[in-house]
Amino acid sequence: MAVTACQGLGFVVSLIGIAGIIAATCMDQWSTQDLYNNPVTAVFNYQGLWRSCVRESSGFTECRGYFTLLGLPAMLQAVRALMIVGIVLGAIGLLVSIFALKCIRIGSMEDSAKANMTLTSGIMFIVSGLCAIAGVSVFANMLVTNFWMSTANMYTGMGGMVQTVQTRYTFGAALFVGWVAGGLTLIGGVMMCIACRGLAPEETNYKAVSYHASGHSVAYKPGGFKASTGFGSNTKNKKIYDGGARTEDEVQSYPSKHDYV
């Protein structure tokens, strides 16, 4: 029972995590315009992995895709790659883990095969989660570096009265979605690996049986040892776990209904 629950919960947690990774990858708010300590602008900028957007105070939003591959920063390309690898591994992991679920019967699939599939999907989820966490962390590091660089020379062209204010970017909602989703996928993967250890058939030890023949004795040992990963009870109880993920785009909101500018 505990093994089925662990496996089912691992699957659900990973499913939510991968849905979160997909959502984060598609979200436009990886970096958002820093509003703190900046002149109050009537335009709000935010950027994703695939396009950058501008929302005017009128409500008009315009997004432009990055229609170039070579012109993009290597770091952004790396983040894209990590997130896509994470999604692909996670999707394959989900597919494998569906067939590995103890509560789902497929033909005469042996428990040892299910155990192997559970372990495989678990490892895939772990790597998927790590890819997402790495991707988001690389992007966050890039933001922090750029933030302090733009703070250092926030006002350029100070030779005269004219000032050009540089737009500084800070962490967007997608980063937090990505971190949480990556963590959930990682946890789900670990749970699948733990479940795997209890899924394989328990060791069956056959005692040696002696057959006495005339003249001399021969010891015959049939069967030997069946391969097993060890502990955990095998249960036939079936429990289906269901889960879903829901993400919402960050909406720029005013601190209060009345603003003085």
Epitope: A42, N45, S52, S57, S58, G59, T167
Partner: antibody, heavy 119, light 113 residues
């Protein structure tokens, strides 16, 4: 077609309060910001602030925060600006305008309300 | 607040002439996110409310004659009327619509000889 109809001219005494109205028609009133602008001869145009009738969100120019108060009645598609503690400096033409969807600028204007403050 | 400086304060021209007027802002009105300049030009004829001519520094309002052209970027902007007509007699204002509070220039009064 989009129209902003403002209330008629007002003659007020110093220290009094006045409420100017701006009735919108021809578009979804709740979806656009209504701007208030002051125009005095020799002083050009001054932005007082804005209100989004749908949410009640308001932004005031710091200069006018103690002078103007914005409200909106979505049932009658009317925006209001109340000016308090009137002085002769408040004598001006007051315009309401709609902030257009593009460019943050004002695409339709009311005809203006002339306010005269005199003892 | 952003200071918008318009020049000249007035100019007198004959019909058919080309006219340029300038508007300078104390800070850049260029938004790096979409590379648009948040500057608007308005025309105010005597006894009328202002009318939007150009927004995003160079985008002409629908219905505005193509003799009106907006140009410039960052802090320096220009409104050009390629061939002035008698009906262009008005005061022209530029407006910062990037930073709150929105601010207007003092205006350029165009007079026809």
């Amino acid at each position: 077609q989009v129209q902003l109809q403002q209330s008629g001219a007002e003659l007020m005494k110093p220290g009094a309060s006045v409420k100017l109205s701006c009735k919108a028609s021809g578009y979804t009133f709740t979806g656009y910001w209504i701007e208030w602008i002051k125009q005095r001869p020799g002083h050009g145009l001054e932005w007082i602030g804005e209100i989004l009738p749908g949410s009640g969100s308001i932004k005031y120019n710091e200069k006018f925060k103690d002078k103007a108060t914005f409200t909106a009645d979505t049932s009658s598609n009317t925006a209001y600006m109340q000016l308090s503690s009137l002085t002769t400096e408040d004598s001006a033409i007051y315009y309401c305008a709609r902030k257009g969807l593009r460019g943050n600028s004002f695409d339709y204007w009311g005809q203006g309300t002339t306010l005269t403050v005199s003892s | 607040d952003i200071v918008m400086t318009q020049s000249p304060s007035s100019l007198t021209v004959t019909a058919g002439e080309k006219v340029t007027m300038s508007c300078k802002s104390s800070q850049s009105l260029l938004n790096s996110g979409n590379q648009k300049n948040y500057l608007t030009w308005y025309q105010q004829k005597p006894g009328q409310p202002p009318k939007r001519l150009i927004y995003w520094a160079s985008t002409r309002e629908s219905g505005v004659p193509d003799r009106f052209t907006g140009s410039g970027s960052g802090t320096d902007f220009t409104l050009t009327i390629s061939s002035v007509q008698a009906e262009d007699l008005a005061v022209y204002y530029c407006q910062n619509d990037y930073y709150y509070p929105f601010t207007f220039g003092s205006g350029t009064k165009l007079e026809i000889k």
